[in-house]
Interface confidence: low
């Protein structure tokens, strides 16, 4: 018997062909011999089956000896053997209807689990294979789970259900709710204005929630909350902000924070959390601030950086257009009795300058 796979909610067309290429009498019945539909001359007649309002045929094909059964808005319980009676012969078609749904919601926070559940007719033994947008395959039977969703898992998941060597494909759009970057680092000279941006990796029509930026300054023994805010339909309103530093926050997305000036006591790491309405869990983005200061005290020229720097970063002091006088993988360098001229303090990573501060040393007479 022919096997046809269908998708819940879709339309399926079961074919039935007579040897005579003309309109003759036919009937479609289910396995309980209940008539679904048939014809009387050129009229379509329907029987007392539960498919009554969802079953149809194509009258335009009857003259060619084709008598299809069309079932709309398929349900799992439509899975059955359908029998077409035409020309004293019977054609049997087994219809198996499957449904594939994502757990609770297709909008999931980064790090959460995605569970895809297959609805299948009793007695079937399908296998499912899903390919994520980043190309990873997962396999299973009635349920498939992926733990620790990543940003790259956002997009269309293509799932193939295999039964009796036949395939049916489902596409499910998954949105992973996350910030575009897990972590960012800002390098600033002392006194400069600092801009922190927290772009989201997704767009939704209405976005409501609340957030907070906790800051652990390098010099401080404990972290503290710098700002708390609310988000209503993509509009940002500040609830509470510290007096020192007094952060400013943009009123629109992307989330944007301004620190009036970079000071050594602010250098450190922050964690911005965003709790979205109707979601358990929070979005996180780490932000780091590195501050540089170049000073001249009497006969000592010093350059210092504060904040979370990698051990491979190089701090150098050099006179403009000359070789570096001092270059160390440390957070402070100095030159005693510096020559007069414009000195540059450079923080670099493998030759790439991340931060630069200039200081003029005047000649001594």
């Amino acid at each position: 018997k022919k096997v046809v796979l269908g998708k819940k909610g879709d339309t399926v067309e079961l074919t039935c062909t007579a040897s005579q290429k003309k309109s003759i009498q036919f009937h479609w019945k289910n396995s309980n011999q209940i008539k679904i539909l048939g014809n009387q001359g050129s009229f379509l007649t329907k029987g007392p089956s539960k498919l009554n309002d969802r079953a149809d045929s194509r009258r335009s094909l009857w003259d060619q000896g084709n008598f299809p059964l069309i079932i709309k808005n398929l349900k799992i319980e439509d899975s059955d053997t359908y029998i077409c009676e035409v020309e004293d012969q019977k054609e049997e078609v087994q219809l198996l209807v499957f449904g594939l749904t994502a757990n609770s919601d297709t909008h999931l926070l980064q790090g959460q689990s995605l569970t895809l559940t297959l609805e299948s007719p009793p007695g079937s033994s399908p296998s499912v294979q899903c390919r994520s947008p980043r190309g990873k395959n997962i396999q299973g039977g009635k349920t498939l789970s992926v733990s620790q969703l990543e940003l790259q898992d956002s997009g269309t998941w293509t799932c193939t259900v295999l039964q009796n060597q036949k395939k049916v494909e489902f596409k499910i759009d998954i949105v992973v709710l996350a910030f575009q970057k897990a972590s960012s680092i800002v390098y600033k000279k002392e006194g400069e204005q600092v801009e922190f941006s927290f772009p989201l990796a997704f767009t939704v029509e209405k976005l409501t929630g609340s957030g907070e930026l906790w800051w652990q300054a390098e010099r401080a023994s404990s972290s503290k909350s710098w700002i708390t805010f609310d988000l209503k339909n993509k509009e940002v309103s500040v609830k509470r902000v510290t007096q020192d530093p007094k952060l400013q926050m943009g009123k629109k997305l992307p989330l944007h924070l301004t620190l009036p000036q970079a000071l050594p006591q602010y250098a450190g790491s922050g964690n911005l959390t965003l709790a979205l309405e109707a979601k358990t869990g929070k979005l996180h983005q780490e932000v780091n601030l590195v501050v540089m200061r170049a000073t001249q005290l009497q006969k000592n020229l010093t350059c210092e950086v504060w904040g979370p720097t990698s051990p491979k970063l190089m701090l150098s002091l050099k006179l403009e257009n000359k070789e570096a006088k001092v270059s160390k993988r440390e957070k402070a360098v100095w030159v005693l009795n510096p020559e007069a001229g414009m000195w540059q303090c450079l923080l670099s990573d493998s030759g790439q300058v991340l931060l630069e501060s200039n200081i003029k040393v005047l000649p001594t007479w």
């Epitope: 990873k136 396999q139 299973g140 039977g141 009635k142 349920t143 498939l144 789970s145 992926v146």
Partner: antibody, heavy 122, light 107 residues
Framework: QVQLVQSGAEVKKPGASVKVSCKVS????????MHWVRQAPGTGLEWMGY????????IYTQKFQGRVTMTEDTSTDTAYMELRSLRSEDTAVYYC???????????????WGKGTTVTVSS | ETTLTQSPAFMSATPGDKVTISCKAS??????MNWYQQKPGEAAIFIIQ???TLVPGIPPRFSGSGYGTDFTLTINNIESEDAAYYFC?????????FGQGTKVEIK
Amino acid sequence: QVQLVQSGAEVKKPGASVKVSCKVSGHTLTELSMHWVRQAPGTGLEWMGYFNPRDDETIYTQKFQGRVTMTEDTSTDTAYMELRSLRSEDTAVYYCATGGNKDYYFYYMDVWGKGTTVTVSS
Amino acid sequence: ETTLTQSPAFMSATPGDKVTISCKASQDIDDDMNWYQQKPGEAAIFIIQEATTLVPGIPPRFSGSGYGTDFTLTINNIESEDAAYYFCLQHDNFPLTFGQGTKVEIK
């Protein structure tokens, strides 16, 4: 360290059934996927199916559908594979193999049993 | 169904030789390929996972390469204890399928 110990060799007549056991030690069976694989004389390995603990379900390959049953007794950490309506071509060495207990690693077959020889002969 | 074509079926090597075994998949399977070693009367041993990653505890003379459809198991400086039956397994799609196996003999 997971170890698998399989039951001894069996000789069966065509039409009979055979039940091969696989005892797990070093880990609880409930957290491991369990695969069954066979190798007939002179042929390659053939996957028969597996049990997925997270979803508590068994998947059989089309070829063995309706003739094989894979079960587990969690109280003794023992997995079983029963093959019915035996034919001479079912003469083979039957192996159990476990996968890991993480999402993508159910299919790894990282630890294998030594195999159980089943001979089907009249 | 993904068919794995493994070659050669048999090979003879001398200690110190470099041996390569090929496994070709009939369709793209990303890096979802594992390699195993089996000695007579013993349980199979998992040696390479995800095409290129050496399983902990396996000597570094074993290595795997490949992606997509063409995969290779390499044994550098083969030793007498490496005489065994080697087979590949794809776990990209159901049904899981195996290569026909390669018997490696040491002279």
